[in-house]
């Protein structure tokens, strides 16, 4: 903590401006009024404060707002956001996408995945659901950030919003997240024709159940091996040799390349050798 001292009269601060960069930590602590700082937060980011000085300013705000900063302050945090911990952010109530955009821009290039994930979580909570505007903002300013949300938060995505999600936005999603997103995607794309449907649903297939994979095999989709390798092991295991053959089409030969890797390995071990032999790939169960 910064030691408390009295502010020298000549150092008294009446507005947040560039003169403050010459203040020592102790002087900032003594001379900057927290309420003034909060009221003029929009000026802070234009001033080249050192990280030490930013620590003091953060401390000021923490004292003024022990229950969490108001959005009027959060929106203008700028580089002060880099000083925030996930615990700090958890206290916030954020509803504005302008606030989200501003802070996502600041965080770019910094190792702040935990803070960004918490921020996005607070935005979703604040807005009540993961609506289209929020998803659009995330995909534009933070590709991959969608997957930082918990399955519980993702469950608030309406199916109508799924169309805004791009394949690269799902690259870092885990199985539990795809389990939540896949049924929404299936619903969102259900009226599309076979080939168009597959293009749209493919990034979400890591959450597909066995029955849907079997059904896909009826649509001549010729699934690529990269997509097949991302399928849930439990969903792949019950597929028959004929179903995998039909699902992969000409890509079935790729099973040989992947035969030592899950889920292919596990699937091979579950099949009768006679059935595997019909593929003519030399797969050994």
């Amino acid at each position: 903590d910064v030691e408390r001292t009295t502010c020298p009269p000549e150092k008294e601060v009446h507005e947040i401006d560039e003169n403050l960069i010459f203040y020592k930590k102790r002087e900032l602590e003594a001379c900057v009024d927290a309420a003034l700082l909060a009221a003029q937060m929009d000026r802070v980011d234009a001033i080249p404060f050192t990280y030490e000085q930013l620590d003091v300013l953060k401390h000021k705000l923490d004292e003024l707002y022990p229950q969490g900063y108001p959005e009027s302050v959060i929106r203008h945090l700028g580089h002060l956001f880099l000083k925030m911990s996930p615990e700090d952010i958890r206290k916030w109530n954020v509803t504005s996408l302008e606030t989200l955009k501003a802070l996502l821009k600041v965080s770019k290039g910094h190792e702040m995945s935990a803070q960004v994930a918490t921020l996005i979580d607070r935005v979703v909570v604040g807005r009540g659901q993961l609506d289209k505007d929020t998803v659009d903002t995330l995909t534009a300013f933070c590709p991959g950030c969608l997957c930082s949300l918990s399955p519980e938060r993702l469950s608030s995505v309406p199916p109508s919003v799924i169309g805004a999600v791009r394949p690269q936005d799902l690259d870092t999603c885990g199985p539990r997240q795809l389990d939540v997103l896949y049924p929404k995607a299936r619903l969102a794309f259900q009226n599309m024709s076979g080939s168009e449907y597959f293009v749209k649903i493919r990034p979400f297939l890591g959450g597909a159940p066995t029955e849907d994979l079997k059904a896909l095999s009826q649509q001549n989709v010729s699934m690529d091996l990269a997509t097949f390798m991302k399928l849930r092991r439990e969903a792949v295991l019950p597929l028959t040799v004929a179903e995998v053959q039909k699902l992969l089409g000409p890509h079935v030969e790729g099973l040989k390349v992947e035969e030592q890797h899950s889920p292919v390995r596990d699937w091979i071990l579950k099949q009768r050798q006679d059935d595997l032999d019909t593929l003519g790939l030399g797969l050994q169960g």
Epitope: E211, A215, S217, T240, E243, K246, G249
Partner: antibody, heavy 117, light 107 residues
Framework: EVQLVESGGGLVQPGGSLRLSCAAS????????MSWVRQAPGKGLEWVAT????????YYPDSVKGRFTISRDNSKNTLYLQMNSLRAEDTAVYYC??????????WGQGTLVTVSS | DIQMTQSPSSLSASVGDRVTITCRAS??????LNWYQQKPGKAPKLLIY???RLHSGVPSRFSGSGSGTDFTLTISSLQPEDFATYYC?????????FGQGTKVEIK
């Protein structure tokens, strides 16, 4: 050993309804798509309907779409075909068949449906 | 829909003969072509799937070949129990369709 036994066939008047059943044994019924295939007297084979292993997806040719409904009860290992608005041209032996990916690998003995006034 | 046309519609042959039945698809079906055998009053039985793979328990005198649109079922040495009707079926695209059948009779 895979066994499929159809029942429920019989004589029905045009416009009438009939429900066929197929009792399956010898394999894990809930793992497989199932189908109905029919054969008019002295004619060839015609695929009638297919249902996914969990019952979510159903497929029909245009000739029966809207009139026939395929369903299943996995707890009873039973496949069904509800046939409504029957026509004379629906007269056939109806076979229940297990469907694997792109072929019908096991068939029941069939049940005859006659549509006549 | 994909049309499947078999030829001949019927043929007469003797035990020990080599028999060939052809099946033509109206469009490319890759190798998703299956053959079934049906005896009078009985259900069809799967013989060959994916053009040339023998279903379990099917004798090796049965073989299949082809790809794309033209396919062949061959019985290398006809046996008494082989007199039956044979159907091809495409499994490439819904609706799945069958050929009209080829009846193999005793000469």
């Amino acid at each position: 050993e895979v066994q499929l036994v159809e029942s429920g066939g019989g004589l029905v008047q045009p416009g009438g309804s009939l429900r066929l059943s197929c009792a399956a044994s010898g394999f894990t019924f809930s793992d497989y798509f199932m189908s109905w295939v029919r054969q008019a007297p002295g004619k060839g084979l015609e695929w009638v309907a297919t249902i996914s292993n969990g019952g979510t997806y159903t497929y029909y040719p245009d000739s029966v779409k809207g009139r026939f409904t395929i369903s299943r009860d996995n707890s009873k290992n039973t496949l069904y075909l509800q046939m409504n608005s029957l026509r004379a041209e629906d007269t056939a032996v109806y076979y229940c068949a297990r469907f694997d990916g792109y072929y019908f690998d096991y068939w029941g003995q069939g049940t005859l449906v006659t549509v006549s006034s | 829909d994909i049309q499947m046309t078999q030829s001949p519609s019927s043929l007469s042959a003797s035990v020990g003969d080599r028999v060939t039945i052809t099946c033509r698809a109206s469009q490319d079906i890759s190798n998703y072509l299956n053959w079934y055998q049906q005896k009078p009053g009985k259900a069809p039985k799967l013989l060959i799937y994916y053009t040339s793979r023998l279903h379990s328990g099917v004798p090796s005198r049965f073989s299949g070949s082809g790809s794309g649109t033209d396919f062949t079922l061959t019985i290398s040495s006809l046996q008494p129990e082989d007199f039956a009707t044979y159907y091809c079926q495409q499994g490439n695209t819904l609706p799945y369709t069958f050929g009209q059948g080829t009846k193999v009779e005793i000469k």
